[in-house]
Interface confidence: medium
Amino acid sequence: WKFMGSKCSNSGIECDSSGTCINPSNWCDGVSHCPGGEDENRCVRLYGPNFILQVYSSQRKSWHPVCQDDWNENYGRAACRDMGYKNNFYSSQGIVDDSGSTSFMKLNTSAGNVDIYKKLYHSDACSSKAVVSLRCIACGVNLNSSRQSRIVGGESALPGAWPWQVSLHVQNVHVCGGSIITPEWIVTAAHCVEKPLNNPWHWTAFAGILRQSFMFYGAGYQVEKVISHPNYDSKTKNNDIALMKLQKPLTFNDLVKPVCLPNPGMMLQPEQLCWISGWGATEEKGKTSEVLNAAKVLLIETQRCNSRYVYDNLITPAMICAGFLQGNVDSCQGDSGGPLVTSKNNIWWLIGDTSWGSGCAKAYRPGVYGNVMVFTDWIYRQMRADG
């Protein structure tokens, strides 16, 4: 977990339930200090593109990888459950070379039948020389990437290329895009669900179907819950992210699969190659597209995007810019809420949700996306709270 965006000073960590600050040494120490006990259930995270399992050490006030010694699938399931994933999502665990780690969390197998974190102790050695890697859900895998692909300046997507992409309909009309992260949860943009569209009964999600004409009554999934980021600002579009929980879980198949949420420790590079997809207009002020389109874009560093000739300090840490400063390729009306993804280690990661921009595909007006890295903590919290 990244303890970011907290109102507590660097030395304190905020309780979600009360907003009070507690000392980092009280976090994950086996005793509940927050009224909701969340200081004891945010003690595990997956780190980096290899999904290395890390546990927070209250003694050292830092995160450490878990040594493979005596580890088994049951502990893996428990760790995933604590992050907010359901048991039946669990994909696999692997082992990764400890790659120079000098500090580990190890299992004390004689600790008896206690909570997993009470079995873990701090160690400077790991005899297996391997750390635990966890896949809580089989995510980020597609059939084939798109051809160089009309968002504006894109081309139609191939079946299975963007299996996490959903079309979110209100009264049989495509309104926004979204991204599947589990069979039950969709990530979209908060501006898509501003009142009165914050009522879940307005929304139906269509997955695995690339043509709007083929999204017929009966093929959609009703939305049960809409959760908008509490700090979303409709004027500035800061914290422009929302979650939708479906009434019935999606059935994953070749054309319906989740994208991976980014893990802490994943560094995004300026000019990194990414893809956007959606049924948005293929020209500014145009109509929604009949077919799913996708396009390559490059990440644009925030400093550059905030320069006077681009967005002049409108870009916050909760936003990412992507596109081309010369224009020509961009997301547009109707793409909102949809994915900005990048591939690393042959896995597709959701790094942005389509948020805003000045016009479509204009020079010096790239697309702006919610920075999903900043929101993963919040996303997992909602998933966990929902049980």
Epitope: G208, I209, L210, N253, V256, S289
Partner: antibody, heavy 121, light 111 residues
């Protein structure tokens, strides 16, 4: 090569049911839809519906709802169509045909051999 | 449902000449840069065979004498020069929306 092999001709009595099969080979069964098309003697083509083996989801032409039921068996890469309460109007050649799904350009690039169904007492 | 009207119902063409078959849709089948109209050839006792997809794209293995054109509601299949093996019934089919429908067919005979 890519093929759709259908079951042989059938002679059935009015009121009976019949299950026609369509075995796919030479491609990944779960990546494409299987469509069913009816052709009455000397007549044109009518689209009955599709099934997507990746998820089992189906779509029926309103005209054939209650008449045709589409299913699949992934393990044998076979699609089935059950025709129920047969009448002389159901006497026809039935084709299965492959189409892409999702982007659903919606054309049929591979066709089955056809199954001739005769309904007669 | 979109109704496809083919004309003529039948035509006789001499070897080496041009055959032109028309298909008119009851509403536009073009959107988002695509025209969702396809053409098939069917010979007696055989299944239909895809010739042209998305109005103008030649299916692989189909001779270049077959070509398709059109957008919106009016589409044409051209065969030039006609060869003996082209005697068959030709069908148009749309996939603009559901249900998918076919034209009634045009029977091509050789003079």
């Amino acid at each position: 090569q890519v093929q759709l092999q259908q079951s042989g001709p059938a002679l059935v009595k009015p009121g009976a049911s019949l299950k026609i099969s369509c075995e796919a080979s030479g491609y990944t069964f779960t990546y494409y839809s299987i469509n069913w098309v009816k052709q009455r003697p000397g007549q044109g083509l009518e689209w009955i519906g599709w099934i997507f083996p990746g998820s089992g989801s189906t779509y029926y032409n309103e005209k054939f709802k209650g008449k045709a039921t589409l299913t699949i068996d992934k393990s044998s890469s076979t699609a089935y169509m059950l025709l129920s309460s047969l009448t002389s109007e159901d006497s026809a050649v039935y084709f299965c045909a492959r189409s892409d799904y999702g982007s659903a350009y919606g054309y049929f690039d591979v066709w089955g051999t056809g199954t001739t169904v005769t309904v007669s007492s | 449902d979109i109704v496809l009207t083919q004309s003529p119902a039948s035509l006789a063409v001499s070897l080496g000449q041009r055959a032109t078959i028309s298909c008119r849709a009851s509403k536009s089948v073009s959107t988002s840069g695509y025209s969702y109209m396809h053409w098939y050839q069917q010979k007696p006792g055989q299944p239909p065979k895809l010739l042209i997809y998305l109005a103008s794209n030649l299916e692989s293995g189909v001779p270049a004498r077959f070509s398709g054109s059109g957008s919106g509601t009016d589409f044409t299949l051209n065969i030039h020069p006609v060869e003996e093996e082209d005697a068959a019934t030709y069908y148009c089919q749309h996939s603009r929306d559901l249900p998918l429908t076919f034209g009634a067919g045009t029977k091509l005979e050789l003079k």
